[in-house]
């Protein structure tokens, strides 16, 4: 509900300064406040605009100050406006100057349908004149010279809402800067009766509080609060839920109060008279000092709060017994909170006696909207009331106010929130390389819209044409590998960025789409690499049996061990062999292979030759004859690599006798470099040469190493070994 | 928490009297006008009495005029309703409630009365 | 008297749909000086009190959930479930409190289909 409150410093204007200050308590109005003059009320009066500014001391609130010297230019009708979702409220007050001829009893007067009522003015002046009374700036009434009493009344027997208006007071040679104006509401309803037809029956509205005639809620007059104006507020504070607070030195004293109508205006609490300059006399409290106190049991009566009940004692005159009751206090509220646009709960928290209830909890949006708990809970101190807003987006950012209205009081907190967009990624991430199991991604997620700074990110990604849920991972890099992916399967993926606070998760951005790779064949078996002459090699496998209808074809890679010279072959997957040629002669290569489809297959081990050789192999090295004995010794010896050398020739013959009486052996694996001659002659020296040969020819042996057996008795003499061929 | 706890339902004949009560907590019970309304079974609600928060102005149904009298004990927070003359068509549910503006914001748990021979 | 009449009667709606309960008064219960409805819309569940869900034709109870709204003026007005759940099976009265006596629809039973 909207809380407009008026206040009239100083409504009889002398020379010193006076103000209107209009003050929107609690809500935020949707256009500004409005303060004007009332020509409805007084169509003669000054005609100037008035020079309205922002109340530095209050958030919502417009101000009119009139410096002393234009005190004559005062004198009317003054209504202040506010509007909030469509609704507007006008609050109407009067300002005079105290020199008149006559002055009002109060500056406006609340009366039921059908009251009897009378209108009262006093004579501060004496003239020899005729009085006159204007309703609404038209004559209604006069009386003779000699006949104005100290009081000048106005009768109205039968009041009906007609009868409502600003009637005013003056001598005949007067004018309206001499003229006193009170202002009568009439009630469209009788006594403690409200609605459309003023048929159903009011609430009471305790201390001096006024009963809506078409809300049946209860006006609280300044200093009172609650559903039935039954609580009073602390010491110098006013509105709806007392949150207001008068700055002056004494409190509110010098301000009157126009609330809207049918209340209109008074003192706060405590004060009385025209100007609310003086103070309640002992025993009355309330508004105007209206309201007497009656304490039960000899209480202490403030002027302010009336019975001040002692403990285990309410009730206006402290005749209830019970628990005190405690104004609500709002706790646990921030007064700022930032929020994640989508689903929030924003929890009112509030203590008292008696505790709130979940109707009695509620939650004003900026525009306005009132919202009720969604969920309510109490402890034995505080209630708990939890709202829902289903989906909270950046214009609902600013003022929000958390209202308690209780029996025992009312209280408001605003606080500010602040919504923020959820981030969420431009652009799609990128794939920078996959493979039949692996994806590296590059999450791209910056730039992004919406709020941050950013959290956590998450990668998604899911097979696309699977009903399965979205995986994601946590990343941290811009760079990030995906594991243990199917092959050959399309996946989808995006990236969803995390603000701070609940509900922080922004929406997946842009969706990429990419492929694995088909899982690797294994490579060919039985590989076998041979040279087949000095400038090729033939390479081997067995039949290749693919178990998918793909293509398929065997890549073969063969480099040079001495030379940075690499090539890769594309062989048909029917074949079983490859030649490999335009190489160097006496040169060592390595060769592997694989299978491929569409995707590359396992690569072979590497296989290892050497093209045949263009020259005569070189002699063996490191000859030597160990192990001698009666009968045998062994020979060893070392060759060089890279000459294609197929065999190893040992040529002996006994010393003296001719060369066609040698004896060759020779040994077709180039791999064994050690051999045991046997069969030989007890003590006899023999001539032995080794040679090696390959597809040229045979070494040239520069000089023969000889041999002699030792007698039979004579153990042998280990001289080392190698491999050895026996 | 506001309640209203009623008692005083039952059976009696036809043309004999019942008083029901309607005691109140929780609530400033003397600043608030107080209704009773009744559900006769299987139907509808239907409007019976309501009396001002001070007891001075009381209204009622024109199906229960002249029969039936609303009051209430503000020093004990009760709200009574006395009814004489029952007939038939008084069997209901009779239900004590607070108002919120004309709304009927709190009710009592409900009291049985049957009126029958 | 100014009279209330509900349609339908009875109403069945699956779980999870929209249900709409219509309210037609006899006369009008917008009161133009501060353009507000006067009427009030109640579920009531069996052996149990009726229960305030909304008031001025459209300002939802404290407490009461927000799949319920208010809409209307003058002589029509609608309250609507906008997603039914099964805790919302009850008897549903509108009330007009524009005059005395306060008058009640004969009320809508809504079930699940």
């Known amino acids: 509900a909207m809380d407009l409150i008026l206040i009239n410093s100083l409504p009889l204007v002398s020379d010193a300064e006076t103000s209107l200050t209009c003050i929107a308590s609690g809500w935020r109005p949707h256009e500004p406040i409005t303060i004007g003059r009332d020509f409805e009320a007084l169509m003669n009066q000054h005609q100037d605009p008035l020079e309205v500014t922002q109340d530095v001391t209050r958030e919502w609130a417009k101000k009119v100050v009139w410096k002393r010297e234009k005190a004559s230019k005062i004198n009317g009708a003054y209504f202040c406006e506010g509007r909030v979702r469509g609704e507007a409220i006008r609050i109407r007050t009067m300002k005079m100057r105290q020199q008149a001829s006559f002055l009002p009893a109060t500056l406006t007067m609340t009366v039921d349908k059908g009251d009897n009522v009378n209108i009262s003015f006093k004579k501060v002046l004496i003239k020899e004149e005729d009085a006159v009374i204007y309703k609404n700036g038209s004559f209604i009434h006069s009386v003779p010279r000699h006949e104005v009493p100290d009081i000048l009344e106005v009768h109205l027997p039968h009041a009906q809402p007609q009868d409502a208006g600003v009637y005013s007071a003056r001598y005949i040679g007067g004018n309206l800067f001499t003229s006193a104006f009170t202002r009568l509401i009439v009630r469209r309803c009788e006594a403690q009766k409200w609605g459309p037809e003023c048929n159903h029956l009011c609430t009471a509205c305790m201390n001096n509080g006024v009963c809506h005639e078409d809300t049946g809620e209860c006006i609280c007059p300044p200093g009172f609060m609650g559903r039935t104006c039954e609580k009073a507020c602390e010491l110098h504070t006013f509105g709806r839920t007392c949150k207001e607070r008068c700055s002056g030195q004494e409190g509110c004293k010098s301000y009157v109060f126009c609330l809207p109508d049918p209340y209109g205006c008074s003192c706060a609490t405590g004060w009385k008279g025209l100007q609310c300059n003086e103070a309640c006399h002992p025993g009355f409290y309330g508004p105007d000092c209206k309201l007497r106190c009656s304490c039960n049991n000899g209480e202490m009566c403030d002027r302010f709060q009336g019975c001040l009940c002692s403990p285990g004692w309410q009730g206006l005159q402290c005749e209830r017994e019970g628990i005190p009751r405690m104004t609500p206090k709002i706790v646990d509220l921030p007064d700022h909170i930032e929020v994640n646009s989508g689903k929030f709960n924003p929890i009112c928290k509030a203590s008292g006696w008696p505790l709130p209830t979940n109707e009695e909890m509620t939650l004003v949006k900026p525009d306005g909207t009132v919202l009720h708990p969604k969920d309510f809970n109490h402890t034995d101190h505080f209630s708990v009331a939890i709202f829902t807003i289903h989906r909270i987006l950046p214009p609902d950012s600013g003022v929000w106010v958390c209202s308690v209205n209780t029996v025992a009081g009312m209280v408001e907190k605003p606080f500010n929130i602040s919504v923020k967009v959820l981030p969420k990624p431009l652009n799609a991430p990128n794939v920078i390389d996959t493979g039949h199991n692996f994806a590296v991604i590059n999450i791209s997620s910056e730039p992004y819209f919406g709020d941050g700074p950013i959290k956590s990110k998450k990668l998604l990604y899911k097979p696309v044409n699977h009903y399965e849920a979205w995986q994601h991972i946590q990343v941290t890099n811009e760079i990030v590998t995906l594991n243990y992916l199917e092959p050959r399967t399309e996946y989808e993926l995006c990236v969803q960025l995390v603000r701070r606070g609940e509900g922080g998760e922004g929406h997946p951005g842009p969706v990429r789409r990419f492929t694995t790779a088909s899982i690797g064949l294994p490579p060919p078996r039985g590989l076998n690499l041979l040279p087949k002459s000095q400038t090729t090699l033939n390479l081997t496998w067995q039949p290749i049996f693919p178990s998918s209808e793909d293509d398929f074809y065997v890549e073969v890679e063969r480099r040079s061990v001495q030379k940075s010279d690499q090539q890769n072959i594309k062989v048909p997957g029917n074949l079983t062999s490859v030649l490999l040629n335009n190489l160097h002669p006496r040169e060592q290569y390595v060769v592997r292979a694989r299978v491929n489809t569409k995707a590359q297959g396992e690569w072979s081990e590497d296989l290892t030759a050497w093209t045949l050789s263009d020259i005569l192999p070189p002699q063996p090295e490191n000859i030597k004859i160990s192990n001698i004995t009666h009968s045998s010794a062994v020979i060893s010896w070392t060759i060089l690599d890279g000459y294609s050398i197929s065999s190893i020739t040992i040529r002996y013959k006994v010393q003296g006798k001719n060369e066609d009486q040698h004896v060759d052996v020779k040994i077709k694996n180039a791999t064994i470099t050690q051999y045991q001659l046997k069969g030989l002659e007890p003590e006899t020296a023999y001539q032995v040469d080794i040679f090696a040969e390959n597809n040229i020819g045979s070494s040239n042996p520069a000089f023969s190493h000889e041999l002699v057996t030792l007698p039979e008795s004579q153990a042998p003499a280990d001289l080392g070994g190698g491999k050895m061929l026996l | 928490q506001v309640q209203l706890v009623q008692s005083g339902g039952g059976v009696v004949q036809p043309g004999r009297s019942l008083r029901l009560s309607c005691a109140a907590s929780g609530l400033t019970f003397s600043n608030y006008a107080m209704h009773w309304v009744r559900q006769a079974p299987g139907k509808g609600l239907e409007w019976v009495a309501v009396?001002?928060?001070?007891?001075?102005?009381?209204y009622y149904a024109d199906s229960v005029k002249g029969r039936f009298t609303i009051s209430r004990d503000n020093s004990k927070n009760m709200l009574q309703l006395q009814m004489n003359r029952l007939r038939s068509e008084d069997t209901a549910v009779y239900y004590c409630a607070t108002p919120k503006g004309g709304a009927l914001e709190i009710w009592g748990q409900g009291t049985v009365i049957t009126v029958s021979s | 008297d100014i009279q209330m009449t509900q349609s339908p009667d009875s109403l069945a709606v699956s779980l999870g749909e929209r249900a709409t309960i219509n309210c037609k008064s006899s006369q009008s219960a917008l009161y133009s000086s501060n353009n507000k409805n006067y009427l009030a819309w109640y579920q009531q569940k069996p052996g149990q009190p009726p229960n305030l869900l909304m008031y001025?034709?459209?300002t939802r109870e404290s407490g009461v959930p927000d799949r319920f709204s208010g809409s209307g003026s003058g002589t029509d007005f609608t309250l609507t479930i906008s997603s039914l759940q099964a805790e919302d099976v009850a008897v549903y009265y509108c009330?007009?409190?524009?005059?005395?006596?306060?008058?009640f629809g004969q009320g809508t039973r809504l079930e699940i289909k």
């Open positions: 001025w034709a459209s």
């Open positions: 009396i001002s928060y001070d007891g001075e102005n009381k």
């Open positions: 009330q007009q409190y524009y005059s005395a006596p306060i008058t």
